[in-house]
């Protein structure tokens, strides 16, 4: 079941220190290994990314119709698709949190959905069938989040916005914002 979409615009998420979850406590030693806690590096800093576009978490706005079999929403819905790279190299020296930024490899951050919203849509069906109402779950915002074993891999595939679309039949992750954990996803929408 195809869906029609066109990109309206894109918003780039510029991560700041507060936007990054605290990495799990690291076990290796008690040393302070990040200059950010000691006032930061002098202005000339090797880890300022030369190409700002190299790492960015973007909110791509898509407008599309929700379909269910032969039925289609009366109006298009607008939602976000999370796209792009996240990485500590994207950040300025004082925004590394407690990351061991100087290591060759470090915490893996991904641009993934942060908040969702529910929207009720009316589906129009051919042949004079009565319109149906359906509640869909749409991505409302994106965020760079540290990858953990609890993230559903369907959200985390590399390369492009295709990966960020919810998978049909996938259980939604419980959310602590009071929204129902069993909120219907975009079933049959794609």
């Amino acid at each position: 079941q195809g869906w029609q979409a066109f990109k309206n615009d894109a918003t780039e998420i510029i991560p700041e220190l507060g936007e990054y979850p605290e990495p799990p406590p690291e076990l290796e030693n008690n040393k302070t290994m990040n200059r950010a806690e000691n006032g930061g590096r002098p202005p000339h800093h090797p880890f300022e990314t030369k190409d700002v576009s190299e790492y960015s978490c973007r909110e791509l706005h898509f407008t599309r119709y929700v379909t269910d079999g032969q039925c289609r929403s009366a109006k298009p819905v607008t939602e976000l698709v999370c796209s792009g790279q996240c990485g500590p190299a994207r950040l300025l020296p004082n925004a590394i949190g407690r990351g061991k930024w100087w290591r060759p490899s470090g915490p893996d951050f991904r641009c993934i959905p942060d908040r969702y919203r529910a929207q009720r849509v009316q589906l129009l069906c051919p042949g004079g069938a009565a319109p149906r109402a359906r509640k869909v779950r749409l991505v409302a915002s994106c965020k760079c989040k540290r990858l953990t074993r609890f993230h559903n891999q369907s959200e985390l595939k590399d390369f492009g916005p295709e990966a960020a679309r919810p998978q049909k039949g996938r259980k939604p992750r419980p959310r602590a914002r009071g929204a129902k954990a069993n909120q219907a996803e975009l079933e049959n929408a794609y």
Epitope: E26, L27, E28, R35, G87, W102, R103, S105, G106, L147
Partner: antibody, heavy 119, light 111 residues
């Protein structure tokens, strides 16, 4: 041209010490985190130790912890590895490598210096 | 025994696409970024991929990296004879005291 040149390798008996040096040129030395990576004959790569821009930023592989000490002298554009209580299994080609991008891999490598530990 | 597991060998003919896998755990690949290195015979290693799928300048776009869960892979398309080399994956490992770990290496042969 960015260059790392290792020196100080040689033949040494088990239990003895050796100090490796790595001289850097062609880039701003203290912009780089620096590491030692070794490769035993016919084997794969093994990370040994790494240091950020100062002594507070140091890590060691478990296999060398307590025996090896990494240090750097930014004034001399040099990296060092003091190897004490050497073992036969420390025999390897030792590479100096660096990265100047956070979590960005080791993007500069030297050609290596050979350490042979044998009685 | 390496912490990251790679097939010891892989092969392909010129023009083919070859994929090299790297398997780890949540303490390394699962939660940290993956790097790939190429080591041509008799030379020092060279960084091919960092941050899972980013190429340093000068690395051809025939090389691409990806990661899913606790596994990563390096794909080489349009295989060329000069691609014959050893390939290593690497990632930080958060277990115990923490260290940078390499895979055992994959010897790529261009037939």
């Amino acid at each position: 041209e960015v260059q790392l040149v290792e020196s100080g390798g040689g033949l040494v008996q088990p239990g003895r010490s050796l100090r490796l040096s790595c001289a850097a040129s062609g880039f701003t030395f203290d912009d780089y985190a620096l590491h030692w990576v070794r490769q035993a004959p016919g084997k794969g790569l093994e990370w040994v130790s790494g240091i950020g821009w100062d002594e507070d930023m140091i890590d060691y592989a478990d296999s060398v912890k307590g025996r090896f000490t990494i240090s750097r002298d930014n004034a001399k554009n040099s990296l060092y590895l003091q190897m004490n209580s050497l073992r036969v299994e420390d025999t390897a080609l030792y590479y100096c490598a660096g990265n100047n991008r956070g979590y960005g891999g080791l993007d500069v490598w030297g050609q290596g210096t050979t350490v042979t530990v044998s009685s | 025994q390496s912490v990251l597991t790679q097939p010891p060998s892989a092969s392909g003919t010129p023009g083919q696409r070859v994929t090299i896998s790297c398997s780890g755990s949540w303490s390394n690949i699962g939660s940290n970024t993956v790097n790939w290195y190429q080591q041509l015979p008799g030379t020092a290693p060279k960084l091919l991929i960092y941050n899972n799928n980013q190429r340093p300048s000068g690395v051809p776009d025939r090389f691409s990296g990806s990661k899913s869960g606790t596994s990563a892979s390096l794909a080489i398309s349009g295989l060329q004879s000069e691609d014959e080399a050893d390939y290593y994956c690497a990632a930080w490992d958060d277990s115990l005291s923490g260290e940078y770990v390499f895979g055992g290496g994959t010897k790529l042969t261009v037939l």
